[in-house]
Interface confidence: low
């Protein structure tokens, strides 16, 4: 629909509260270093302007696009050049180039202080003193650290955040009530951010076709009773929503997501039998619930795929008439029959099918040529199955921490040029696949594991893209979205790597390690492990295990000592010397 004033249209659709929240998220995701107060001021100015347009859509500037209005507002920030450097050059451009320029300057790893959680009483006082500011601050802090966070979903997180404080700040034991809820929100938030980052990378780096293929596969698994036409409609709408959010068009995105949830619920009879509970929920919960809904049961007696896609004499004719539609139908039919496959595996199969048809439909005897295409799928299916089996066995044998350590060593040897914090973060997340997926029965392991690994490896890709240091990482990240995981799995030890020089300072520890949480202590130890491998890439598992066991004993001993700092200094020197000897450094 054409509206005289886009800003008035969105304000009316979304309501003031959400309009303000979404504009705050948008601004914080673009200008990640700006103080909270500056953003609130900008948001209030935009909101006041929007109200004038609601009152009179013909008022001055009300006909301007949202990009123009928001971009003009961002470009009024006085310290743009000092704070953001070359990003200030974006302001010299016209739309749509200016918005593209802002998007390119989004920073996946902004130089911001770690969020430290205050005492519960301090948080509750702040919540009660000014609930609105408290919640806005939450939106701001998450949005600036996660510049691709799915904005309508962040509204849902904020609602849960508010609910947690509302309930727990009046509980007898505030901390016991609140802290587990905040931990859960933090962990879910990080996972949600990473999943959305993959969607945006898919759209931005590989294009709409790649995203649509992913969506066809995933929605066909989830809604196997829906017709292909229905799935296609949902894919088109979903692609629009994510294109908007990834492009910074958060008001349009939130509005369209609400419309999509409404459509799904109004048509649930022709989509899925699993949607009833979701559709009884309020909007934000409803949208979240639909996005996470379990797969519907597969229709009984689905015919063999071979009839339409291998045996039919019309395969090449159908393919030639509408290539993407025919491939989409293949993907839909395959995915609805295989909820036990990962989406990326389904996309590999579809790619193999496409490549075969491209070759065979130009051959003298097309049918003879593509008759055995399904045989080519077997090794593609077995590779992730075997990998998951081996790694789940290793996880069950080692437990999460040691499994993470095994992956740390494995990945540091593959790509030792990558920064230590990135290797630690990515390997820890890769290691979480064990506790997340290995508990599942066989039929659910692959979609859980391989699609999760795609999300984690995308984190590596986006962090590496900011400061590229490894051609191998660049190659695996850019050649094929669906083959990223097999590409990384296939990497062997980098024989060209020149070991890092030994620096005793890297292995010097202090008494402050004793007061750290278990998680933070693990990260310290895992950081040391990565550094060890960078110094001695050819160290054996046994050598590294011995050094890490000594290190754990050293930390435990010194944390029990009366004079901890002296213990760390003296015993630390001995440990470094012993480790150097053990590793032949």
């Amino acid at each position: 629909d054409a509206h005289k004033s886009e800003v008035a249209h969105r304000f009316k659709d979304l309501g003031e509260e959400n309009f303000k929240a979404l504009v705050l998220i948008a601004f914080a995701q673009y200008l990640q270093q700006c103080p909270f107060e500056d953003h609130v001021k900008l948001v209030n100015e935009v909101t006041e302007f929007a109200k004038t347009c609601v009152a009179d859509e013909s008022a001055e500037n009300c006909d301007k696009s949202l990009h123009t209005l928001f971009g003009d507002k961002l470009c009024t920030v006085a310290t743009l050049r000092e704070t953001y450097g070359e990003m200030a050059d974006c302001c010299a451009k016209q739309e749509p180039e200016r918005n593209e320029c802002f998007l390119q300057h989004k920073d996946d790893n902004p130089n911001l202080p770690r969020l430290v959680r205050p005492e519960v009483d301090v948080m509750c006082t702040a919540f009660h003193d000014n609930e609105e500011t408290f919640l806005k601050k939450y939106l701001y802090e998450i949005a600036r650290r996660h510049p691709y966070f799915y904005a309508p979903e962040l509204l849902f997180f904020a609602k849960r955040y508010k609910a947690a404080f509302t309930e727990c700040c009046q509980a007898a034991d505030k901390a016991a009530c609140l802290l587990p809820k905040l931990d859960e929100l933090r962990d879910e938030g990080k996972a949600s951010s990473a999943k959305q980052r993959l969607k945006c990378a898919s759209l931005q780096k590989f294009g709409e076709r790649a995203f649509k293929a992913w969506a066809v596969a995933r929605l066909s698994q989830r809604f196997p009773k829906a017709e292909f036409a229905e799935v296609s409609k949902l894919v088109t709408d979903l692609t629009k929503v994510h294109t908007e959010c990834c492009h910074g068009d958060l008001l349009e995105c939130a509005d369209d997501r609400a419309d999509l949830a409404k459509y799904i619920c109004e048509n649930q009879d022709s989509i899925s039998s699993k949607l009833k509970e979701c559709c009884e929920k309020p909007l934000l919960e409803k949208s979240h619930c639909i996005a996470e809904v379990e797969n519907d049961e597969m229709p009984a007696d689905l015919p063999s795929l071979a009839a339409d896609f291998v045996e039919s004499k019309d395969v090449c004719k159908n393919y030639a008439e509408a290539k993407d539609v025919f491939l989409g139908m293949f993907l839909y039919e395959y995915a609805r029959r295989h909820p036990d496959y990962s989406v990326v595996l389904l996309l590999r199969l579809a790619k193999t099918y496409e490549t075969t048809l491209e070759k065979c439909c130009a051959a003298a005897d097309p049918h003879e040529c593509y008759a055995k295409v399904f045989d080519e799928f077997k090794p593609l299916v077995e590779e992730p199955q075997n990998l998951i089996k081996q790694n789940c066995e290793l996880f069950e044998q080692l437990g999460e921490y040691k499994f993470q350590n095994a992956l740390l060593v494995r990945y540091t040897k593959k790509v030792p040029q990558v920064s230590t914090p990135t290797l630690v973060e990515v390997s820890r997340n890769l290691g979480k696949v064990g506790s997340k997926c290995c508990k599942h029965p066989e039929a659910k392991r692959m979609p859980c594991a391989e699609d999760y690994l795609s999300v984690v490896l995308n984190q590596l890709c986006v962090l590496h893209e900011k400061t590229p240091v490894s051609d191998r990482v660049t190659k695996c990240c850019t050649e094929s979205l669906v083959n990223r995981r097999p590409c990384f799995s296939a990497l062997e030890v980098d024989e060209t790597y020149v070991p890092k020089e030994f620096n005793a300072e890297t292995f010097t520890f202090h008494a402050d390690i004793c007061t750290l949480s278990e998680k933070e202590r693990q990260i310290k130890k895992q950081t040391a492990l990565v550094e060890l491998v960078k110094h001695k890439p050819k160290a054996t598992k046994e050598q590294l295990k011995a050094v890490m066991d000594d290190f754990a004993a050293f930390v435990e001993k010194c944390c029990k000592a009366d004079d901890k700092e002296t213990c760390f200094a003296e015993e630390g020197k001995k440990l470094v010397a012993a480790s150097q000897a053990a590793l032949g450094l």
Epitope: E17, N18, E280, K281, P282, L283
Partner: nanobody, 124 residues
Framework: EVQLVESGGGLVQAGDSLRLSCTAS????????MGWFRRAPGKDREFVGA????????WYSDSVLGRFTISRDNAKNTVYLQMNSLKPEDTAVYYC?????????????????WGQGTQVTVSS
């Protein structure tokens, strides 16, 4: 800011019926549950009932279950409370409210926006 306006209150006899309306000034994007509460003289505000935006789900307090019915007309941004078989103990100021959509619809603290209230008096 969403404004809520209740109407339809008044003085009735025990056993009579009354229909209250509550209209929202705008469609609350994130606030999809609308609830009714009441405050009897000298008592705390208590939950009466609530309805989801879709109208699929409704909740009622035990004291009104079977006598009161909540419905809504989304096109008009309006929610209704149909009260049948009224009793003197139903005398109260009735408030409508909009909840933010995070469960616990029986609790006042879940509701973001409140109307001014409309007086219902049931004489014996």
């Amino acid at each position: 800011e969403v404004q809520l306006v209740e109407s339809g209150g008044g003085l009735v006899q025990a056993g009579d019926s009354l229909r209250l309306s509550c209209t929202a000034s705008e469609r609350p994007f994130m606030s999809y549950v609308m609830g009714w509460f009441r405050r009897a003289p000298g008592k705390d505000r208590e939950f009466v009932g609530a309805i989801t935006w879709s109208g699929i789900n409704t909740w009622y307090s035990d004291s009104v279950l079977g006598r009161f019915t909540i419905s809504r007309d989304n096109a008009k941004n309006t929610v209704y409370l149909q009260m049948n078989s009224l009793k003197p103990e139903d005398t109260a100021v009735y408030y409508c409210a909009v909840a933010d959509g995070v469960g616990l619809y029986r609790y006042e603290r879940q509701y973001d926006y409140w109307g001014q209230g409309t007086q219902v008096t049931v004489s014996s």
